[in-house]
């Protein structure tokens, strides 16, 4: 079977049909269902929408759709005994709380089980001591602090300011540092934009307002207690000390009120420089300790939240593929919040529930794709990416075999200003092509298509007339389908103008504003911004699902392959003594990357010339592109990584939202210098440089003929 | 509409004790820091107690300290005052009044004011 007779709408049609078909008063109305209460992974309410959002994909049309649960370890406040950090004087005496939870927004005052602000998974303990500011907790931060300005952390609790970089990575930071705890906070010079007023009168953080999230180390490996395979009724439990990823100091997020507090009193040394003052009126002094008149007075901190083995639920909804019903292509997208999750996750969650009805009508009316499309509504995202990661290693051995893509859906929007978009390489040319046939949204923009507007608002670095397309990091769900399964993925949403804003996220991340009102007020009243979003996310899934030819370009990736050779290489040169020393050479990289340069291009060549009426062919063409992205898996991980697995991007290690090219070589050079043996370093590179070499060779080879 | 309304006041020996209410309508409450404020015959208001929000902070005037606790119940919206071992320098006419910016304290920036409630110690 052609994929025409799947269908009888005529091919030209079906991508129109299915795009008229969205709607953004639907969307909407779905966000405003999805956020009237919390959905807090692991609770009874977050559950009931998992029940609720099965029932309307069976009557939207899709084949069949489940529910998948696993007993997963989640992390909660104690409800009787209230996290909060305290001044304490001579005699112990506490004489400044930090608050117990954020006021409520208007209208919300009297919703229950509201979480207060905690920073999940951290341990229990009450830790007293003289106070350190870190800025940021990057690991730059830290090597100015201790090398710089020699201050030892060892015995301190280190306040953080948010941003930059994922919080878990400051707390590993902290860790490593010898600090007895951690406070973080959100400062207004990241979380408040200048001449926007604070919610609920703009969109900007108010002073009460604070950050949740997790603070895990999991470097993929999903559920703490079960890395490697699914969280089943069966599955064997690892004892808390051998869990994977957690902290083991105590960790609590404050919003810049109570942040004022404890950093007016700051003695110590002063700032090395302005890049770490914020925008409260306090010093930024960075301690050991209070000034003078306070110098008896210590920091508590008083953690009591529990871990707890709790069930959480995926929702799978299948629409099953007319002609290659084993090629999956996946859209999926987190269901739980923080609190009501007016953008992180519902903005997403809703625009996946307008594809699902809009592929249903489609489907009632006769049309199937030609692949089969999953959907899913993940559980315990902000947990750990906890849902996602365990329904794909339950589902590993198909998911490899079978998987073309993966399209991420979590919040459509983090601002109002241009499309973002971070992908595989193999997906470049189909974002071009499909948003040059989508209209802009953009004020100024009316008539034109959303190409032009996000190219004009965010040119690529290299090549002028195309929009910038970002490298794909982790902290979201795709994590485990792209970095260790290999399987194609892509995401895209509306995001701020980062010229003018320097903020981290939007300020309102992960608080309790993060509301219904917040979205339709100020970010998108008429939700187009969402109906585009909805349009890029599900044409792509379209175009993935349904056309002949997997819309793959491999000569993209090569292209990118010799830019990700050569920054690495330049890397390296910073150490040319070394590079002698040690016989460091990168020409086997650079070898492997010409040979896949031009293996793509003849592959790219074949494809146009093949006879796409000969399904054996096609199919054989087609897995080629669909393995290419496998190929870059190496099977025993990065190091000390081992659910990282994909050779050419990774996780940065010191920045989990960040994707490194080449992260192997990457972490081998790092900080080399300050090696205490410079010969086994230096081997490692060496070691490094050949994994990434044998591996793209390995790759090109795949696009080779077969025979 | 937006009130505030004290009750609890009345006459008291030296040495007793007196606890004071103050239920707020017309505003979320909860999200609101509070004040208890008194003003004593012939002279001018002086600032008695403040509490956060969530209850997290009580500060106390220097007068009170150790004697008064400020104390609220946000699933009542009641804002209490205890008053313990009140001395003839008590005597005032005690107002409620709420925090003009949501979810921080200051000193002196009130929006909303009880009618007040008079306390009057004597023996």
């Known amino acids: 079977k052609s994929s025409n007779e799947a269908t009888n709408i005529t091919p030209k049609h079906n991508m129109k049909a299915f795009l008229d078909e969205l709607k953004a008063e639907n969307i909407k109305k779905f966000l405003y269902n999805f956020t009237q209460i919390p959905h807090l992974a692991g609770t009874e309410q977050n559950f009931q929408l998992a029940k609720q959002i099965q029932s309307q994909w069976k009557e939207f049309g899709l084949d069949s759709v489940e529910l998948a649960h696993y007993d997963v370890l989640l992390s909660y406040p104690n409800k009787t005994h209230p996290n909060y950090i305290s001044i304490i004087n001579e005699d112990g005496n506490e004489i400044f709380n930090t608050s117990l939870f954020e006021p409520p927004p208007p209208g919300y005052e009297n919703v229950s089980d509201i979480v207060p602000p905690f920073s999940a998974f951290s341990p229990q303990g009450m830790p007293e001591g003289d106070l350190v500011y870190v800025n940021y907790a990057r690991t730059e931060d830290f090597f100015k602090l201790e090398r710089d300005m020699k201050i030892n952390c060892s015995g301190k609790i280190v306040i953080a300011r948010y941003g930059k970089v994922f919080r878990g990575n400051k707390v590993k930071n902290a860790q490593l540092a010898g600090a007895k705890g951690v406070i973080l906070y959100s400062d207004p010079a990241d979380y408040f934009a200048p001449g926007v007023k604070s919610y609920p009168d703009g969109w900007n953080l108010p002073g009460g307002g604070v950050q949740r999230g997790n603070i895990l180390n999991l470097n993929g490996a999903g559920d703490p207690l079960t890395p490697g395979y699914p969280a089943n009724e069966y599955a064997y439990r690892r004892g808390i000390a051998e869990a994977v990823g957690l902290p083991s100091i105590p960790v609590h997020p404050i919003g810049y009120y109570d942040a004022q507090k404890l950093l007016e009193k700051m003695g110590g040394s002063a700032p090395p420089d302005s890049s770490w003052r914020g925008s409260l009126k306090v010093p930024y002094n960075v301690g050991p300790g209070f000034t003078g008149n306070f110098s008896t007075q210590k920091v508590k901190m008083h953690i009591h939240s529990t871990n707890e083995v709790t069930r959480i639920y995926n929702v799978i909804g299948t629409l099953r593929g007319a002609v290659e019903p084993d090629r999956y292509v996946i859209l999926g997208g987190h269901r739980d919040s923080w609190v009501f999750g007016g953008i992180d996750p519902q903005s997403g969650a809703a625009v996946v529930h307008e594809i699902v009805r809009s592929f249903g009508t489609l489907k009632k009316e006769g049309w199937r794709p030609r692949r089969t499309i999953l959907f899913a509504s993940w559980d315990a995202e902000e947990f750990g990416l906890l849902g996602s990661t365990e329904w794909a290693e339950e589902n590993s051995r198909l998911l490899q075999e079978r998987g073309v893509a993966y399209i991420n859906a979590d919040s459509s929007i983090e601002g109002n200003y241009t499309l973002r978009v971070d992908c595989t390489p193999l997906m470049y040319s189909l974002v071009h092509n499909l948003t040059k046939e989508l209209k802009s949204p953009d004020e100024g923009f009316e008539g034109k298509s959303l190409y032009e507007s996000w190219t004009k608002k965010s040119p690529s670095p290299e090549f002028s007339g195309m929009p910038r397309i970002s490298k794909l990091g982790s902290g979201n769900d795709f994590e485990v389908f792209f970095q260790r399964l290999g399987i194609a993925s892509g995401r895209a949403r509306y995001t701020k103008n980062w010229e003018t804003n320097k903020f981290s996220g939007y300020p309102l991340y992960h608080s309790v504003y993060e509301t219904y009102e917040l979205v339709e007020k100020f970010y998108d009243p008429m939700f187009k911004y969402h109906l585009t979003v909805a349009q890029v996310r599900g044409g792509m899934v379209f175009e993935l699902a349904n056309s002949i030819v997997l819309p793959f370009d491999c000569r993209d990736y090569a292209v990118v392959l010799r830019k990700y050779a050569d920054k690495i290489y330049s890397i390296s040169m910073k150490h040319p003594q070394e590079m002698k020393t040690y016989s460091v050479s990168f020409d086997s990289l650079f070898s492997a990357v010409k040979n896949f340069t031009e293996i793509a291009s003849k592959f790219s060549e074949r494809l146009q010339d093949f006879d796409k009426s000969n399904p054996i062919v096609l199919r054989m063409m087609n897995d080629q592109l669909m393995f290419l992205e496998r190929a870059f898996i190496d099977p025993l991980g990065l190091p000390d990584r081992p659910f990282y697995r994909h050779v050419i991007y990774a996780p940065s290690s010191h920045n989990k939202y960040a994707g490194e090219s080449f992260p192997g070589i990457y972490d081998a050079l790092f900080d080399i210098e300050s090696k205490v043996d410079p010969s086994k370093a230096w081997g490692e590179v060496k070691r490094q440089i050949y994994v990434a070499a044998f591996t793209v060779q390995a790759a090109a080879e795949t696009l080779s003929e077969v025979a | 509409q937006v009130q505030l309304v004290e009750s609890g006041g009345g006459v008291v020996q030296p040495g007793r004790s007196l606890r004071l209410s103050c239920v707020a309508s017309?505003?979320?409450?909860?999200?609101?820091?509070m004040h208890w404020v008194r003003q004593a015959p012939g002279k001018g208001r002086e600032w008695v107690a403040v509490?956060?929000?969530?209850?997290?902070?009580?500060y106390y005037a220097d007068s009170v300290k150790g004697r008064f606790t400020i104390s609220r119940d946000n699933s009542k919206n009641t804002l209490y005052l205890q008053m313990n071992s009140l001395r003839p320098e008590d005597t005032a006419v005690y107002y409620c009044?709420?925090?003009?910016?949501?979810?921080?304290?200051?000193?002196?920036?009130?929006?909303?004011w009880g009618q007040g409630t008079t306390v009057t110690v004597s023996s």
């Open positions: 009044a709420k925090e003009r910016i949501f979810g921080v304290l200051t000193p002196d920036d009130f929006d909303i």
């Open positions: 017309g505003f979320p409450f909860i999200s609101y820091g």
């Open positions: 509490i956060s929000y969530d209850g997290s902070n009580r």
